[in-house]
């Protein structure tokens, strides 16, 4: 029987979201509760680690929200962005595989604001390579498991 | 051994992006540099050609951006759209499989604007059929390989 | 030979879209015309029913649009949202797997407005579980088959 195809679906752990508005790496994710799950991949130090060479479909869904009860925004002009990055242990450099997002004007005229980003793509990943998620304005992240998550599943071997 | 499953991940070649704000077909894509790759499919004349019947997952990520240093926009009200189309050589007509996008108001009050679209879906494709990408406002495309790309991978055979 | 992998791609049936601006479940979808298709899954009562345990990639693309010829919007501040939900017959409760969308300001200064949402993710589904789509502002849905659709395809078995 073929070795089970690796996959992961990781959902945001909002207990430890950074406070800045700059681009930060999100290191706290669930891998074993609710919709979150992982098989034949490893989650460590905020990174999804590839254990098996292959071509994988990677995806991320990132939701941002603001309610006026959370306080006044420091600026109404926001860059709400996600970057899906790959790091190789052998060559300690980070490369962005996918990016998405939007500039938004979240004015005080509305009491609630929301915006979601979805990205996905097909990439060759080698054992030991690491996938991580960077976002801007992390304190605006929606902490629900259906809102902010990323994942991967292996589609085929490398020839 | 089963024939290796076809796939492609094509990234924008920004050296030849059309000007204008109308809907145009994007014909310049990389297939063999950086994240771009192709196997058991063909890229020719700006189209991704299917070589093997099957059900494929198709996806596209299209990023638009504008910085005030690029000059004034002709209009601040924009339609930023993508259309993933299928053409059959046998029946020379084009059909839109997927579309996405947004109307945007990119005012001069902000020096930078950004917006990304992601679409994806599962389609039956026959050998010889061609997939192409049309966008509005091509001069606003983000030329990075992590920003503007499309792809496909075969999931299963046709019964 | 392995049982053929289940899949579905369902496109909106706009002849029966609810009115109103509240969150509603969309029950009318095509499964056998145009791009719409289904295999080893069942579509019944507005829900996509799983017939085979497994890990599936689920996706949805939802487009909203408004033209001034359709009349004035009741409010220019809109929440345009999609929720992909899973219901288990054994435990009659509904859980949101994925959500996406945006708050939008669709002012009367522009004659046409458009916005699309895309979500996708990898989930364990058991036979008998049902997938459905809820949206806000259903009367603003784009009725084209390339615009508003959802689907699923099985990627691997459950160990």
């Amino acid at each position: 029987k073929l070795e089970a195809q690796p996959f992961a679906h990781l959902t945001i752990n909002a207990t430890d979201i950074p406070s800045g508005s700059h681009k930060v790496s999100l290191s706290s994710w669930y891998h074993d509760r609710g919709w979150a799950k992982i098989s034949n991949m490893t989650f460590s130090n905020g990174k999804l680690i590839v254990n098996q060479d292959g071509f994988y479909y990677l995806y991320a869904n990132i939701c941002f929200r603001h309610h006026e009860t959370s306080g006044d925004l420091a600026t109404e002009y926001l860059q709400l962005m996600v970057y899906v990055t790959k790091t190789s242990i052998k060559i300690p450099s980070s490369h962005t595989l996918m990016k998405g997002g939007s500039t938004k004007y979240w004015s005080g005229n509305s009491e609630f604001h929301f915006y979601s980003i979805n990205v996905g793509g097909f990439f060759k990943l080698r054992s030991g390579e690491e996938i991580s998620i960077e976002v801007s304005n992390p304190s605006l992240l929606d902490p629900d498991q259906d809102a902010t998550y990323f994942g991967a599943f292996k589609v085929r071997d490398i020839d | 051994k089963l024939e290796a499953q076809p796939f492609a991940h094509l990234t924008i070649n920004a050296t030849d992006i059309p000007s204008g704000s109308h809907k145009v077909s994007l014909s310049s894509w990389y297939h063999d540099r950086g994240w771009a790759k192709i196997s058991n499919m063909t890229f020719s004349n700006g189209k991704l050609i299917v070589n093997q019947d099957g059900f494929y997952y198709l996806y596209a990520n299209i990023c638009f951006r504008h910085h005030e240093t690029s000059g004034d926009l002709a209009t601040e009200y924009l339609q930023l759209m993508v259309y993933v189309t299928k053409t059959s050589i046998k029946i020379p007509s084009s059909h839109t499989l997927m579309k996405g996008g947004s109307t945007k108001y990119w005012s001069g009050n902000s020096e930078f604007h950004f917006y990304s679209i992601n679409v994806g879906g599962f389609f039956k494709l026959r050998s010889g059929e061609e997939i192409s990408i049309e966008v509005s406002n091509p001069s606003l495309l983000d030329p990075d390989q992590d920003a503007t790309y499309f792809g496909a991978f075969k999931v299963r055979d046709i019964d | 030979k392995l049982e053929a992998q289940p899949f579905a791609h369902l496109t909106i049936n706009a002849t029966d879209i609810p009115s109103g601006s509240h969150k509603v479940s969309l029950s009318s979808w095509y499964h056998d015309r145009g791009w719409a298709k289904i295999s080893n899954m069942t579509f019944s009562n507005g829900k996509l029913i799983v017939n085979q345990d497994g890990f599936y990639y689920l996706y949805a693309n939802i487009c909203f649009r408004h033209h001034e010829t359709s009349g004035d919007l009741a409010t220019e501040y809109l929440q345009l949202m999609v929720y992909v939900t899973k219901t288990s017959i054994k435990i009659p409760s509904s859980h949101t797997l994925m959500k996406g969308g945006s708050t939008k300001y669709w002012s009367g200064n522009s004659e046409f407005h458009f916005y699309s949402i895309n979500v996708g993710g990898f989930f364990k589904l058991r036979s008998g579980e049902e997938i459905s789509i809820e949206v806000s502002n259903p009367s603003l849905l784009d009725p084209d088959q390339d615009a508003t659709y959802f689907g699923a395809f099985k990627v691997r078995d459950i160990d």
Epitope: S19, S21, G71, D72, A74, T75, N137 | - | -
Partner: antibody
Framework: QVQLVESGGGVVHPGRSLRLSCAAS????????MHWVRQAPGKGLEWVAV????????YYADSVKGRFTISRDNSKDTLYLQMNSLRPEDTAVYYC????????WGYGMDVWGQGTTVTVS | DIQMTQSPSTLSASVGDRVTITCRAS??????LAWYQQKPGKAPKLLIY???SLESGVPSRFSGSGSGTEFTLTISSLQPDDFATYYC?????????FGQGTKVEIK
């Protein structure tokens, strides 16, 4: 470690100008709003001005409005306070302080410099 | 502008005492209140933000409560290091103001 260092203080005659600087290190400066707060000799703290992380929004106390200008250079990790038309009542120790939240106002100031003294006489 | 009034202005206490400082706002500020500690010749130090959230690294003997117009800072058991001046600071509609301060001194 996280640090803010003010400079540019000194003795100046009324009506003259002075520019204070605040050099940041140990955190992503471009991700946080920054304040200037002052303290006259033997008195309490008085808020002076604030600037958002991207520099788009600036707010001032009524006592300095029209005379003081807050600015920042994110490429140099530096905050500035341009003080014009100085008055004797502007005499104080001037502190720069980092916003606890980069996204929201109102969460307090979690990192402070050691202060720089401005004397107007 | 919103005025912040602290009481008392001076408080004499002993090590081990439970100490409470009050801050009143001239109009509602929801929970947008912070508390600071300042020692002579030093910069202020953030203790509490959003009325009741303890800043990282601050001892748990410090706590904050209140909302609207009335707020309190409580030190459950006064330690030698706690003798200092304490300031409340409000935020409301793009304006920040401090209270006049409360000096906690040794009895």
């Amino acid at each position: 470690q996280v640090q803010l260092v003010e400079s540019g203080g000194g003795v100046v005659h009324p009506g003259r100008s002075l520019r204070l600087s605040c050099a940041a290190s140990g955190f992503t400066f471009s991700g946080y709003g920054m304040h200037w707060v002052r303290q006259a000799p033997g008195k309490g703290l008085e808020w002076v001005a604030v600037i958002s992380y991207d520099g788009t929004n600036k707010y001032y106390a009524d006592s300095v409005k029209g005379r003081f200008t807050i600015s920042r250079d994110n490429s140099k990790d530096t905050l500035y306070l341009q003080m014009n038309s100085l008055r004797p009542e502007d005499t104080a120790v001037y502190y720069c302080a980092k916003c606890l939240s980069g996204t929201y106002w109102g969460y307090g100031m979690d990192v402070w410099g050691q202060g720089t003294t401005v004397t107007v006489s | 502008d919103i005025q912040m009034t602290q009481s008392p202005s001076t408080l004499s206490a002993s090590v081990g005492d439970r100490v409470t400082i009050t801050c009143r706002a001239s109009q509602s500020i929801s929970s947008w209140l912070a508390w600071y500690q300042q020692k002579p010749g030093k910069a202020p130090k953030l203790l509490i933000y959003k009325a009741s959230s303890l800043e990282s690294g601050v001892p748990s003997r410090f706590s904050g409560s209140g909302s609207g117009t009335e707020f309190t800072l409580t030190i459950s058991s006064l330690q030698p290091d706690d003798f200092a001046t304490y300031y409340c600071q409000q935020y409301n509609s793009y304006s920040w103001t401090f209270g006049q301060g409360t000096k906690v001194e040794i009895k």
